[in-house]
């Protein structure tokens, strides 16, 4: 049920899950100079029952220089700045997404975690795409990707997003308004990210997150 491959990569775009399906694993990765505590978990696991889902296990990092102790090291000034940035990057959580039955919210950051989170997604997981700062959507069809099982093999659907540099010679006759109602794309199937203009999205999301945390890797 784990997805074999990684979500599609779109030039100048990043993806983010708004909620994580039960069964998703998040590696307990520590930043440079830190490591998992000796008896610590290798990963966090999204588990739950019919009414509530949450992350099992906690990730804990300790200084690589510290032996046989779980004492946390006080960050240096530069590290404090980095930690603060990570806290500012907590993703937008639309209530309907984050409280989906059988899904976990984004886990809160832990002390001295790595800058990129490595998730192991499961079939049925959906991720949402947006253009990185400095780029805007030239074309936005369904801007999400879902991990599906087909013929015994997992694969991600292709998000339809084309990002172009704001300074490139592009013509944008209107904000993200269709010329005609896209009948093939009912509201229930669209990403919440397509309900406003791209510049609004970038402003809103840039205020809360940076590209690095938006780029999710996994094996």
């Amino acid at each position: 049920e784990l997805c074999d491959d990684d979500p599609p990569e779109i030039p100048h775009a990043t993806f983010k899950a708004m909620a994580y399906k039960e069964g998703t694993m998040l590696n307990c990765e520590c930043k440079r100079g830190f490591r998992r505590i000796k008896s610590g978990s290798l990963y966090m696991l999204c588990t739950g029952n019919s009414s509530h889902s949450s992350w099992d296990n906690q990730c804990q990092c300790t200084s690589s220089a510290t032996r046989n102790t779980t004492k946390q090291v006080t960050p240096q000034p530069e590290e404090q700045k980095e930690r603060k940035t990570t806290e500012m990057q907590s993703p937008m959580q639309p209530v309907d997404q984050a409280s989906l039955p059988g899904h976990c919210r984004e886990p809160p950051p832990w002390e001295n975690e790595a800058t990129e989170r490595i998730y192991h997604f499961v079939v049925g997981q959906m991720v949402y795409y947006q253009c990185v700062q400095g780029y805007r959507a030239l074309h936005r069809g369904p801007a999400e990707s879902v991990c599906k099982m087909t013929h015994g093999k997992t694969r991600w659907t292709q998000p339809q997003l084309i990002c172009t540099g704001e300074m490139e010679t592009s013509q944008f006759p209107g904000e993200e308004k269709p010329q005609a109602s896209p009948e093939g794309r009912p509201e229930s199937e669209t990403s919440c990210l397509v309900t406003t203009t791209d510049f609004q999205i970038q402003t809103e999301m840039a205020a809360t997150m940076e590209t690095s945390i938006f780029t999710t890797e996994y094996q």
């Epitope: 030039p11 069809g141 292709q158 084309i162 006759p173 209107g174 993200e176």
Partner: antibody, heavy 118, light 107 residues
Framework: EVQLVQSGAEVKKPGATVKISCKVS????????MHWVQQAPGKGLEWMGV????????NYNQKFKGRVTITADTSTDTAYMELSSLRSEDTAVYYC???????????WGQGTLVTVSS | DIQMTQSPSSLSASVGDRVTITCKAS??????LSWFQQKPGKAPKSLIY???RLVDGVPSRFSGSGSGTDFTLTISSLQPEDFATYYC?????????FGQGTKLEIK
């Protein structure tokens, strides 16, 4: 089944304008952007531009210096490429292409030959 | 614009041969590179995308490699139907640009 069907061959005089159509079937037209590619006889492929079938946004190759206009009609699921101020070197096969799967240009029209001759 | 330099421009080989075609980008294209095969009078056909990922239905004798600016298409054992012209395409930045093509002919 995904299909891109282009209009037929055209013969034009220098200075004229040609408009080629690309009718789509087998998928939701507004979901997928449409690209146009030029191929002169015995030559390579040249990307001309792209249109968002969803909102009409376009991006053009400046090599065509404002002579190319790409449009889309969502009521008929048809994309168009118009090339103006035609010259002999515009004699070429023109393809529409879309990125339906995980990769660019995985579906192509059959091509439209435009001959520019006085 | 990003320039794509493909080499060789033509190549003669025999059935069963291993063939390599290279494509060099004028700047880093983040592996956003595709390879296409085109036969006379036909539209191009996608073979490889994202530098090394095989398009569904394409035989495994085709493979792609490379990153940054240098990319390679390899056909491990040429079949009669592989004689065609091959193009690389960068789709990292607009305008998208193709290599000038490599014509693969029967020796």
């Amino acid at each position: 089944e995904v299909q891109l069907v282009q209009s037929g061959a055209e013969v034009k005089k220098p200075g004229a304008t040609v408009k080629i159509s690309c009718k789509v079937s087998g998928y939701t037209f507004t979901d997928y952007a449409m690209h146009w590619v030029q191929q002169a006889p015995g030559k390579g492929l040249e990307w001309m531009g792209v249109i968002s079938t969803y909102n009409g946004n376009t991006n053009y190759n400046q090599k065509f210096k404002g002579r190319v206009t790409i449009t889309a009609d969502t009521s008929t699921d048809t994309a168009y490429m118009e090339l103006s101020s035609l010259r002999s070197e515009d004699t070429a096969v023109y393809y529409c292409a879309t990125s339906y799967g995980n990769y660019p240009f995985d579906y192509w029209g059959q091509g439209t030959l435009v001959t520019v001759s006085s | 614009d990003i320039q794509m330099t493909q080499s060789p421009s033509s190549l003669s080989a025999s059935v069963g041969d291993r063939v390599t075609i290279t494509c060099k980008a004028s700047q880093d294209i983040n592996s956003y590179l595709s390879w296409f095969q085109q036969k006379p009078g036909k539209a191009p056909k996608s073979l490889i995308y994202r530098a090394n990922r095989l398009v569904d239905g394409v035989p495994s004798r085709f493979s792609g490699s490379g990153s940054g600016t240098d990319f390679t298409l390899t056909i491990s054992s040429l079949q009669p139907e592989d004689f065609a012209t091959y193009y690389c395409l960068q789709y990292d930045e607009f305008p998208y640009t193709f290599g000038q093509g490599t014509k693969l002919e029967i020796k």
